[in-house]
């Protein structure tokens, strides 16, 4: 698995009429300018947006703001010293931090989450740091599409 | 300066083959039709070159400004596959092609290997230890 010697030659890009994930018998694809890593596609912004703007931009790409499975999910960018909006917000109804799909934040993901201000949104650094910041603040953001 | 993103959310976005299709080794990333090994360990330029060769790939090369800005956004610095034999020689790629882009600090005779560092290329001592990344075009 760690070798390129058996690469099949295929066209560099598959033209597609829309931004749906292209799937064929053995292949999935990420949109151009998205990063493919461990069966997921990520869009890593360089522009700064509010949390809501970020959420809408991800949604417009049939993706959502990053939902982390574990703290090494973005291992490939663990050297980054930027913070990015992720898809975590506080639900007054459930009195819990929830991801966009409604699942609850694992207490093991951010040990300091109990000190987060529930009026804020969460900015994440891929090294594992998380900050609660006003949702009106501007940060870069990460969108995620799960392919499997 | 952050690269412009106005085209990134167009409705006719092209697609690229992703790692999980078997085109890139496990734990590599795919971006714009290339596979990248994102190194954590530090090596000299020559050691980095050999490390990438052993992975059947090449020391990081930069094909365009968009790629440079993407990489710079996720990595603080990295060796790239550009060097010169001395300050009297031109900068060349590991494939032997002339490298035309501006490399900072080129006037320093001790700095004969190139580094990508936050949206710019600069020269560095080939014997110093830096993080390296490898690339393989699909």
């Amino acid at each position: 698995k760690n070798s390129f010697t058996k690469l099949s030659i295929e066209p560099a890009f598959t033209p597609g009429p829309n931004i749906e994930l292209q799937k064929d018998s053995d292949c999935c694809s990420c949109q151009e300018k998205w990063v493919g890593y461990r069966c997921n596609c990520y869009f890593i912004s360089s522009e700064q947006k509010t949390w809501n703007e970020s959420r809408h931009l991800c949604a417009s790409q049939k993706s959502s703001l990053l939902q982390l499975q574990n703290t090494d999910e973005l291992d490939f960018m663990s050297s980054s010293q930027q913070f990015y909006w992720i898809g975590l917000s506080y639900s007054e109804e459930h009195t819990a931090w929830l991801w966009e799909n409604g699942s609850a934040l694992s207490q093991y993901l951010f040990p300091s989450f109990e000190t987060f201000n529930t009026k804020n949104c969460i900015a994440y650094n891929p090294n594992g740091n998380a900050l609660d910041e006003s949702c009106e603040d501007k940060n870069r953001y990460i969108c995620k599409q799960q392919l499997i | 300066i952050p690269f412009l993103e106005q085209n990134n959310f167009s409705p006719n976005t092209r697609t690229q083959k992703a790692r999980h299709c078997g085109h890139c080794p496990e734990e590599w990333i795919t971006y714009s039709n290339s596979c990248y090994y994102i190194g954590k360990e530090r090596r000299t330029w020559e050691e980095s070159l050999l490390a990438c060769t052993s992975k059947n790939s090449s020391l990081l090369s930069i094909d365009n400004e968009e790629e440079m800005k993407f990489l710079a956004s996720i990595l603080p610095s990295s060796w790239i596959g550009v060097f010169r034999n001395s300050s009297h020689h031109p900068w060349v790629t590991i494939n032997g092609l002339a490298f035309k882009h501006k490399i900072k600090d080129s006037d320093n005779a001790e700095l004969n290997c190139a580094v990508l560092q936050v949206n710019r290329l600069k020269s560095a001592q080939c014997g110093s230890s830096m993080i390296y990344h490898c690339k393989h075009k699909l």
Partner: antibody
Framework: QVQLVESGGGLVKPGGSLRLSCAAS????????MRWIRQAPGKGLEWVSH????????YYADSVKGRFTISRDNAKNSLYLQMNSLRAEDTAVYYC?????????????WGQGTLVTVSS | DIQMTQSPSSVSASVGDRVTITCRAS??????LAWYQQKPGKAPKLLIY???SLQSGVPSRFSGSGSGTDFTLTISSLQPEDFATYYC?????????FGQGTKLEIK
């Protein structure tokens, strides 16, 4: 190019007030956290306060909490520090500072500083 | 709060010398470390960020290394304009903190 210019420093009596201003230019002001850092004469550097891009997230060092107020006006590209109940130990050069492009919390650009002297 | 301890607090050296200044964090800060140079009457100037990345415009004789708790700033061949005070700073967690400074003097 990035420029940060502080003003408003001067001599003030203990218990008095001062308002420092910082005029920013050469970058998109609303995209960056802004900081105030101070340096007492002959001493090291000390974080005073910072403010997030929208002005909603704010931090103060314990030594100034309750006495200093940081604010910003993104329309005017300006940063402010309102200093009340000043003490002799607040005497310092106050620097307005902007984060580095790549590294949050690292100061990429500093103003020239403005001296605040608290003395009777 | 994370404490940053620099050593030595002062060092005397000559033009052409190689000088190393160390900085130790009281807890791990990954590579969230910066180095600054300050000359009398002037604002500090960023030299190194992310522990080892050289700030644009800074001469290549300056280099940084380290990760976790132990970091070094090295000046490979001292120039007359390098005599100044050097500070390390952690940006890993609030409140961000500076080392106490290392004064580099002419021998």
């Amino acid at each position: 190019q990035v420029q940060l210019v502080e003003s408003g420093g001067g001599l003030v009596k203990p218990g008095g007030s001062l308002r420092l201003s910082c005029a920013a230019s050469g970058f998109t002001f609303s995209d960056y956290y802004m900081r105030w850092i101070r340096q007492a004469p002959g001493k090291g550097l000390e974080w005073v306060s910072h403010i997030s891009t929208s002005g909603s997230t704010i931090y103060y060092a314990d030594s100034v909490k309750g006495r200093f107020t940081i604010s910003r006006d993104n329309a005017k590209n300006s940063l402010y520090l309102q200093m009340n109940s000043l003490r002799a130990e607040d005497t310092a050069v106050y620097y307005c500072a902007r984060d580095h492009y790549y590294s949050r919390g690292v100061i990429g650009y500093w103003g020239q500083g403005t001296l605040v002297t608290v003395s009777s | 709060d994370i404490q940053m301890t620099q050593s030595p607090s002062s060092v005397s050296a000559s033009v052409g010398d190689r000088v190393t200044i160390t900085c130790r964090a009281s807890q791990g800060i990954s590579s969230w470390l910066a180095w600054y140079q300050q000359k009398p009457g002037k604002a500090p100037k960023l030299l190194i960020y992310a522990a080892s990345s050289l700030q644009s415009g800074v001469p290549s004789r300056f280099s940084g290394s380290g990760s976790g708790t132990d970091f070094t700033l090295t000046i490979s061949s001292l120039q007359p304009e390098d005599f100044a005070t050097y500070y390390c700073q952690q940006a890993n967690s609030f409140p961000y903190t500076f080392g106490q400074g290392t004064k580099l003097e002419i021998k």
